[in-house]
Structure formats: structure tokens, C-alpha cells
């Protein structure tokens, strides 16, 4: 059974992940972002089901495409802190939350999504899990 300290750690990690995803989304949705139209042409795979921490496998599998889109987006009006650092921090948190050796084979929905839909889906996931922990 999870201890109160492990639950607290999980909650903090989810909150960190949530903030990182929200920061990316806010940057993309910035009305000054000149590359938004181009960014929306990139397609992301969405999980069929995302209700447990192990389903973060599906986010892990999309980190390289996410990094590529954010690299494309960098401009004077859209500037995240180092994209590589941001994606790597997300990578580390995801591995800690789901376990670095999960054997789950992610199931994806038939329809692909834009980066905005993709980020919103994972933001909702984090918020949902956090609410069950608090």
C-alpha cells in the first residue's frame, strides 16, 4: 500500500509535470506565436485510455515529436526555457511516476490530435490523478 510520503511525492511530481505542460501550452497559445499555424499541422497520438499512472507510457512515447515541434516553435515571441531541458525534465518525471520498466503497450486512439489537444489531454490527466490523491 502506498505510504503518505510516497503519495505526497507522487502528488508533487504530478504538479511539476502539470506546470511544465501548462507552460508549454501557454507559450503555444500566446497570440503572438507566429508559428502556431505550422505547429498545428503536426499530429500527435492520443491514448485510448489514460486513467492510471502507468498510462503515462503513452506520453513518454510522444516526447521526441513534442521536442521537435517545440524546437520549430522557438522565436523571439515564443521562447521556452531550453526545450531540451524541459523535455528531459518531463522525461525523468514520467519515468519516476510510471516506473522505468513498465511493460504496458500503449493503446492509441484512431484519430490523431494537434499539439494543443495533446497537451490539454495530458493536463486533464494530471489534474484528474492529483484530485484523487488530495
Amino acid at each position: 500500500a502506498p505510504t503518505s510520503s510516497s503519495t505526497k511525492k507522487t502528488q508533487l511530481q504530478l504538479e511539476h509535470l502539470l506546470l511544465d505542460l501548462q507552460m508549454i501550452l501557454n507559450g503555444i497559445n500566446n497570440y503572438k506565436n507566429p508559428k502556431l499555424t505550422r505547429m498545428l499541422t503536426f499530429k500527435f497520438y492520443m491514448p485510448k485510455k489514460a486513467t492510471e499512472l502507468r498510462h503515462l507510457q503513452c506520453l513518454e512515447e510522444e516526447l521526441k515529436p513534442l521536442e521537435e515541434v517545440l524546437n520549430l516553435a522557438q522565436s523571439k515571441s515564443f521562447h521556452l526555457r531550453d526545450t531540451k531541458d524541459l523535455i528531459s525534465n518531463i522525461n525523468v518525471i514520467v519515468l519516476e511516476l510510471k516506473g522505468s520498466e513498465t511493460t504496458l503497450m500503449c493503446e492509441y486512439a484512431d484519430e490523431t490530435a494537434t499539439i494543443v489537444e495533446f497537451l490539454n489531454r495530458w493536463i486533464t490527466f494530471c489534474q484528474s490523478i492529483i484530485s484523487t490523491l488530495t
Epitope: S88, V92, L95, E101, T103, M105
Partner: antibody, heavy 118, light 108 residues
């Protein structure tokens, strides 16, 4: 279960060509980088380069750029490391490994021993 | 490229003792990129620690990682017979990815 299975040991002569393979299973092969690492006899680990099978994006360590070619065939979940003209100094154990975006090599193949001798 | 220097080269200890391995980088980078591996003779390396301090699944809690900037440490709180091996640190803070030269932990 995530597995990377490498092709068998090779004994070659200097000047010959060679292509060794690494087959992935138990995960979505197109979603992770595959890295190649060299370990010369009695020595440490050296990163050679990586390939992302999803789009064949390939990056090399400057030390190995032009010396080897890394490729992949996503239809059969395989990555390859090849030489066009082997040298005695290429004698080593070569490992493939799945590489996360943050750089950790979380799953490793069993290694392929390449011996180059006249 | 970032050069990683591991010390000591060899550590001679007895089972039950504490092992402290050092990895020093030639330039600073985020701890997200610091990794430790264990390699036993005739085997492929195995991921131990990622993100400087996170244990990979299945790694006993006697293994711990710490550090930031340019100085990182791997600690084995109580050496078990199966822990005698070579340990490598690795970074990917900047390309190319590089490994330290390794520290051999041998039985005294």
C-alpha cells in the same frame, strides 16, 4: 517485455565491410532512439551515435562521424551499424540500447563482438 | 564535449562497507541528464540511476545518487557480493553523449 536482440559475433579481415543488427520487441520501436555504444577490450564505454526509427533522424558522435553508418528499418523493428572498410582498431564489443530523450540508455542488447584481424 | 572524470579508478572494499563513487564534469549541466550504470564482466551495462538521483525500477534502495552542476556521487550504503562491478556515469546535457572512464569496485 522490452528486448533488444543483436546479431552474432563476427570475425573479419581488414578492409572488409560489415553490417550488424539490433532487433527490438516489446515496445513501440518507432517512438524511441536507438543508440550504439562501443567497448574496446578492457576499456570503457563510448557513445557512437543514435537513430530515431520513426523518421530516421540520425546523430553521430564527432569521433565516429564518417567512420560508421547507422540506419534502421522500422518495418521489421531493426537498427543497424555498418562499416564499409574495417580496421584492426574496430575490434570491440558493440552494444545497441534504447535511448530516452533525456539520454538514459534504459534497455541494452547483449552485445555483438566484432574481431578484425588479418 | 563534456568530459566526465570518475574517481577513484578502483575502490577496494569489503561486503557490508559503504562505497562512494565520484563523477566530475568539465562543465555544468542539468541533473536531469546524469545517469549511472553498473557493468559486470561479460554482461551489458545496466541502468541504475537516472536524473542524478532516481533509481531505475528494480534497483535496490542501497543505491543512491546525488549531486548537481559539475559534481555527482553514487553511494552504495552497504555493499552486497553482487555489487562488485564497474560503475560508469554518463551525461547528455550536451551532445555528444559521454561516459566517465568508470570506477571498479573490487573485493578487498
Amino acid at each position: 517485455e522490452v528486448q533488444l536482440v543483436q546479431s552474432g559475433a563476427e570475425v573479419k579481415k581488414p578492409g572488409e565491410s560489415l553490417k550488424i543488427s539490433c532487433k527490438g520487441s516489446g515496445y513501440r520501436f518507432t517512438s524511441y532512439w536507438i543508440g550504439w555504444v562501443r567497448q574496446m577490450p578492457g576499456k570503457g564505454l563510448e557513445w557512437m551515435g543514435i537513430i530515431y526509427p520513426g523518421d530516421s533522424d540520425t546523430r553521430y558522435s564527432p569521433s565516429f562521424q564518417g567512420q560508421v553508418t547507422i540506419s534502421a528499418d522500422k518495418s521489421i523493428s531493426a537498427a543497424y551499424l555498418q562499416w564499409s572498410s574495417l580496421k584492426a582498431s574496430d575490434t570491440a564489443m558493440y552494444y545497441c540500447a534504447r535511448q530516452q530523450v533525456a539520454g538514459m540508455l534504459d534497455y541494452w542488447g547483449q552485445g555483438t563482438l566484432v574481431t578484425v584481424s588479418s | 564535449e563534456i568530459v566526465l572524470t570518475q574517481s577513484p579508478g578502483t575502490l577496494s572494499l569489503s561486503p557490508g562497507e559503504r562505497a562512494t563513487l565520484s563523477c566530475r564534469a568539465s562543465q555544468s549541466f542539468s541533473s536531469s541528464y546524469l545517469v549511472w550504470y553498473q557493468q559486470k564482466p561479460g554482461q551489458a551495462p545496466r541502468l541504475l540511476i537516472y536524473g542524478a538521483s532516481s533509481r531505475a525500477t528494480g534497483i535496490p534502495d542501497r543505491f543512491g545518487g546525488s549531486g548537481s552542476g559539475t559534481d555527482f556521487t553514487l553511494t552504495i550504503s552497504r555493499l552486497e557480493p553482487e555489487d562488485f562491478a564497474v560503475y560508469y556515469c554518463q551525461q547528455y546535457g550536451s551532445s555528444p553523449l559521454t561516459f566517465g572512464g568508470g570506477t571498479k569496485v573490487e573485493i578487498k
